[in-house]
């Protein structure tokens, strides 16, 4: 198995992590996709997932996590808004393809969130916390948990990540179709 690689992103509290995970267009377009945190000992845990089948350009918000699957571009966009120091950890995008193992989209994201300096745009928590006030619903999780080791047989597409401050974020207050999709770091 190929060694798992990771990209490190250092952000300030209040900023937004914006990750684009590329995938093969036709093959995985409607497959359910998920954002996971990696616990100690290679134990991924799902934090949020798209619907099943995954809808095109349809935002799914789970707390401060927003997933958007762009079928036409073959990418899953993951945003974690209003970042907190406790969000620091190792994350990955995966595509569910039961009964087979989930397909992991490289690279893993090593997120390091530090305290912002007062007065800097990235440290203004209030600029995002009211925009993303959609609580999770309480229906049973739709995301299955796959626990097999993440092995890779070929070099998968690379994921890319951008960062932005709260001021550049899109207001998602009218996102109503929220999928409730659990977590260790």
């Amino acid at each position: 198995a190929t060694k798992l690689t990771e990209e490190k992103y250092e952000l300030k509290e209040g900023q937004t992590l914006d990750v684009k995970c590329d995938y093969t267009l036709e093959k995985f377009a409607s497959s359910q996709k998920a954002w996971q945190i990696i616990r100690d000992g290679e134990m991924p845990k799902t934090l949020a997932c798209t619907e099943r089948p995954s809808k095109n350009s349809h935002p799914v918000q789970v707390g401060r996590i927003i997933l958007e699957d762009y079928h036409d571009h073959g990418l899953l966009r993951v945003r974690m808004v209003n970042l907190q120091v406790e969000d620091s950890g190792l994350y990955q995008c995966v595509i569910y393809q039961p009964p087979k193992e989930p397909h992991m989209l490289f690279d893993r994201i090593r997120l390091v969130v530090t305290k912002g300096f007062s007065g800097t745009p990235g440290s203004n928590e209030n600029s995002t916390q009211n925009v993303y006030k959609i609580p999770p619903t309480t229906t049973k999780a739709l995301c299955p948990l796959y626990t097999s080791p993440r092995t890779v047989t070929q070099a998968p597409p690379k994921s890319t990540a951008d960062v932005s401050t709260p001021d550049s974020e899109i207001n998602l207050t009218n996102v109503t179709d929220i999928i409730r999709v659990p977590v260790f770091n």
Epitope: R39, E42, V62, K140, C143, L145, N185
Partner: antibody, heavy 120, light 112 residues
Amino acid sequence: QVQLVQSGAEVKKPGASVKVSCKASGYTFTSYYMHWVRQAPGQGLEWMGVINPSGGSTSYAQKFQGRVTMTRDTSTSTVYMELSSLRSEDTAVYYCARESDGIDSYFDYWGQGTLVTVSS
Amino acid sequence: DIVMTQSPLSLPVTPGEPASISCRSSQSLLHSNGYNYLDWYLQKPGQSPQLLIYLGSNRASGVPDRFSGSGSGTDFTLKISRVEAEDVGVYYCVQARQTPLTFGGGTKVEIK
């Protein structure tokens, strides 16, 4: 239905090792993480670690690092917890507990417990 | 490690009366997905623990509706609206926000 059946009580001498088993049935064994939690007599619950039954990877509490080994046998749907260099403070009931799937990180099924007594 | 502090240590109750147990964590248990990773278990005498509440406020399947969980971040409460004799045992909160998982010290509920 889901069942976790643990091995019987053990009496060990200080310095020895003990290996407790937990046989799972009623679900897909490799699809759920399995944790080990112990409880000393009259005391509270203490998390020891977790094993991924599919890949066999593990994560242990710092306190038990170097003394505990968690393994699994997928052919028999059994997980094992071995604790070495036993001391009297290790006298406890040891539980295996299955972690729920999806987002909900709770223990939905527990074994009946295995009493391990460490005494000279 | 996250430290979980439960109170009271012991709670003598009268059947039919309400009861409340508090649990505090040294760090926030609220994850980025909006869920509080705090669960409540009841361990009846001579039995394995059983799940009551998960993710802070969700009642587990088969748990009577007299049990409710509330709170967010670092402060959580388990409430029993009307205690029944079968509710005696030790109640534990546990955080599943990060490894190592850590349990509260337990609250022993007994009938007066």
